[in-house]
Amino acid sequence: MNSFNYTTPDYGHYDDKDTLDLNTPVDKTSNTLRVPDILALVIFAVVFLVGVLGNALVVWVTAFEAKRTINAIWFLNLAVADFLSCLALPILFTSIVQHHHWPFGGAACSILPSLILLNMYASILLLATISADRFLLVFKPIWCQNFRGAGLAWIACAVAWGLALLLTIPSFLYRVVREEYFPPKVLCGVDYSHDKRRERAVAIVRLVLGFLWPLLTLTICYTFILLRTWSRRATRSTKTLKVVVAVVASFFIFWLPYQVTGIMMSFLEPSSPTFLLLNKLDSLCVSFAYINCCINPIIYVVAGQGFQGRLRKSLPSLLRNVLTEESVVRESKSFTRSTVDTMAQKTQAV
């Protein structure tokens, strides 16, 4: 986003009228936070608590299964991406409480806010990988039987992480701390200064690669999968499919405000009223995007409870049931019952 996408508190007697009140003492530190910032703080607090505990639990559950169960590999990587992002929250929280003052230095300014973008790219690339996996299971069952293994899944995850890091670099490079003269404050943000074209390019790439292109491909992918599953009852794995669709849907819902405001700000002049309005909403948009970091464990638990019916289960076993269930394709025309059973035994060891 442009220049410095963090706003300062309003100073009632500062920069508003052309009059001097020589008896009014200057309030150099405002005590009031804006409503969007308060909402952002509430969201950050909830996301941190749910995200750290929930994702730690998902990591713990899936880590044991990741050697042999491919679904566990996918969900483990998603949880690690979310968990990493949650670790930056206390610092972002502190900064907002201090009216976006950044006392943590330049290195922290470059690294910590970039974690959420790393999470965005890692998540969407992992979701694309998972979706490709679901697609292949439905449409290329024989190929899956022969080649779908844990090794290939880990390679796919490594590629996703590598690409995510690569896509995060521009934001990382342009993040700087700026100390403002009045009100006295150190801010952390992106500064493209002379290069408006580069700023727009970064925003467009982020929107296209991190949002629009995945939205298009995943929509097409799941449309085909759902059509096949509904028409032929082709998979046993509707459970995982429902979970993945929910995760993908939440991803796009919660990233939407951030992406929209980001692209708008890159095309606006920093001094324009619209830019300043969007600027004020920036923390709220970031916090809304951060919901992605805690929503997945919630989806898993809700899905688990739905699948278990009234059966009471411990949280770890409930998660294990959702996250480590292997997908086995069942095509009545292509396979006999015994073939499917043999295949089921085989994939459990993958």
Epitope: T7, T8, V26, E180, Y181, P270
Partner: antibody, heavy 121, light 112 residues
Framework: QVQLVQSGAEVKKPGASVKISCKAS????????MNWVRQAPGKGLEWMGR????????KYNGKFKGRVTITADESTSTAYMELSSLRSEDSAVYFC??????????????WGQGTTVTVSS | DVVMTQSPLSLPVTLGQPASISCRSS???????????LHWFQQRPGQSPRLLIY???NRFSGVPDRFSGSGSGTDFTLKISRVEAEDVGVYYC?????????FGGGTKLEIK
Amino acid sequence: QVQLVQSGAEVKKPGASVKISCKASGYAFSNSWMNWVRQAPGKGLEWMGRIYPGDGDTKYNGKFKGRVTITADESTSTAYMELSSLRSEDSAVYFCARFLLISTVTAVDYWGQGTTVTVSS
Amino acid sequence: DVVMTQSPLSLPVTLGQPASISCRSSQSLVHSNGNTYLHWFQQRPGQSPRLLIYKVSNRFSGVPDRFSGSGSGTDFTLKISRVEAEDVGVYYCSQSTLVPLTFGGGTKLEIK
């Protein structure tokens, strides 16, 4: 009207310290930042630091690496700037300049007449 | 630090003719509150600097209307519509958006 009256010219030896005063009148001294700016002969302007007399809060230009100390006395509406470990390149005209915080101007609007400091052995 | 680059260094102008001074900053001077704290000062020979224009385009009290400022982000301009004899001196652009406050190298306006 706003007036900033500075102390007279100083001649110092290298390694010594100099303390310049700036007496303010015509406005609420506590409601502004007092800045110190210097100008070497034939050169441009260089900001040294500021003080908020209301609470003594200061900010310095990192270039001066702890050599500069800015203080203020609210009772006499006077700001002071002390520069230690003087070297020949510190020979300059030193200005105090007000930055009024409670107006729409929010700029360094009024300047003192300047104090010439000569550092010579 | 924000580097302020002024051009030209010297500006010989005929009385009554317009004059224009350019100032470019190494970083955006847009403050997080939306304001741009770019100012112009005039320093007549042997005098202290005097504020002419504050926040890009606002004339300070007592400044003649022949002085005007414009620009945004990193590029700014001071214009004098008709130069008068009393306008001779050095003109500085300055920013008070970021710490430390910085000034341009100055532009010396002289009469041809």
